[in-house]
Amino acid sequence: YSHWPSCCPSKGQDTSEELLRWSTVPVPPLEPARPNRHPESCRASEDGPLNSRAISPWRYELDRDLNRLPQDLYHARCLCPHCVSLQTGSHMDPRGNSELLYHNQTVFYRRPCHGEKGTHKGYCLERRLYRVSLACVCVRPRVMG
Amino acid sequence: YSHWPSCCPSKGQDTSEELLRWSTVPVPPLEPARPNRHPESCRASEDGPLNSRAISPWRYELDRDLNRLPQDLYHARCLCPHCVSLQTGSHMDPRGNSELLYHNQTVFYRRPCHGEKGTHKGYCLERRLYRVSLACVCVRPRVMG
């Protein structure tokens, strides 16, 4: 069980909403995926994990913040602008785009709590939405009607 | 703004749920859904959200648990066993498999806390990993060595 340190105010502590505020403002959007400089990595393997066998392969990039729960998040980064041919596993097929799938994940930030006279009273948890890229997906390009 | 839900009530503090209620918005993926003529069909659309334009299309299924945070999680469910042809958007290509991408997401369960003499002292949050399927990915089948 996780008993969060002083995320609930103690007796007599000011429980104003200022103290335990939270925000649902998404963190600024991540940079669009760029194809990897090394063209040899833009291929679909016949073994290994899902992200390397995908015809829209991707790698993971660590995003660590010790004041956030979870502390470690991983962002997908597409290795190819287009999908890789199912036949060869290496040549790109311009009829398909490799696009990032995004998700707004609930995370919690540890923030100092302040008591009656502005004294530090442990830590509060601030809930936020954090934009992560989960994977790269091979899609048909949009046809604008 | 919101008060954190009674994860560590202190001595003498009123831990009634009225006091400790808080609001949130379910966190689905970013792109709004568009109508899909055949919502459960195995085809790759040329418009609409990523999950219907993918050549490994999927739908989302709600998983709701009122004692968990987030309360609403969405599991991807693949609509095709194989990938859809980039050319036609409808015929399946047996050279590619549509596979679920899984992720162990950090969630929090609300559990009763117990005080000094086993008395109920509000709620604690228990941190756990919960397996969710994020998307369906078009992959080359594994070649066993």
């Epitope: - | 209620r21 609001s23 379910p26 689905p28 993926p29 792109e31 999950n51 709701r64």
Partner: antibody
Framework: EVQLVESGAEVKKPGASVKVSCKAS????????MNWVRQAPGQRLEWMGL????????SYNQNFKGRVTLTVDTSASTAYLELNSLRSEDTGVYYC???????????????WGQGTLVTVS | DIQMTQSPSSLSASVGDRVTITCSAS??????LNWYQQKPGKVPKLLIY???SLHSGVPSRFSGSGSGTDFTLTISSLQPEDVATYYC?????????FGQGTKLEIK
Amino acid sequence: EVQLVESGAEVKKPGASVKVSCKASGYSFSGYTMNWVRQAPGQRLEWMGLINPYNGGTSYNQNFKGRVTLTVDTSASTAYLELNSLRSEDTGVYYCAREDFDSWTYFAMDYWGQGTLVTVS
Amino acid sequence: DIQMTQSPSSLSASVGDRVTITCSASQGISNYLNWYQQKPGKVPKLLIYYTSSLHSGVPSRFSGSGSGTDFTLTISSLQPEDVATYYCQQYSKLPYTFGQGTKLEIK
């Protein structure tokens, strides 16, 4: 003002399909889950399923054995209920209902459409 | 699925009376219970959510109580406009389920 306006009454033959629409206005359509509830003559309310307009995520009542499909058109702020393989016992009023919520406490259908009468005979 | 059972199925009371309707769940649902009012020929309306919280615009003569498996809807002083069928609904687990309804009439 929040409003849910449903399509008109339908008369169908057994084995046919029906598609009922529910146009929402007065709030952010993508921000609230939409429920569908049926009321057969003289019967209790029966929950059919829900859909999150934001991602098309659904949950269905298995009592309908896969005959129900829920969809949305966010650009038109409209939710749809499709019921296949109709039988006489599907006769009733079909309601769409917006779901409000507050974590740890409630999920409640706070606004309802006027209902669509579907007659199967 | 969780079964919801209301009692009585119908009742008749006089204006000014205190009226009580009960709702029982087949398993514990904490406080995850709503009450709806459906007037004759009308659409259901949310009355009470989360066992005891009054929805906006609902008169204070309505109140709800209970926890676990047994719940009560009370009208402290019955008014003519309260003639309706009342439904309880659990949302502890999907699928949502409703009680069979209690039809309230004026004597």
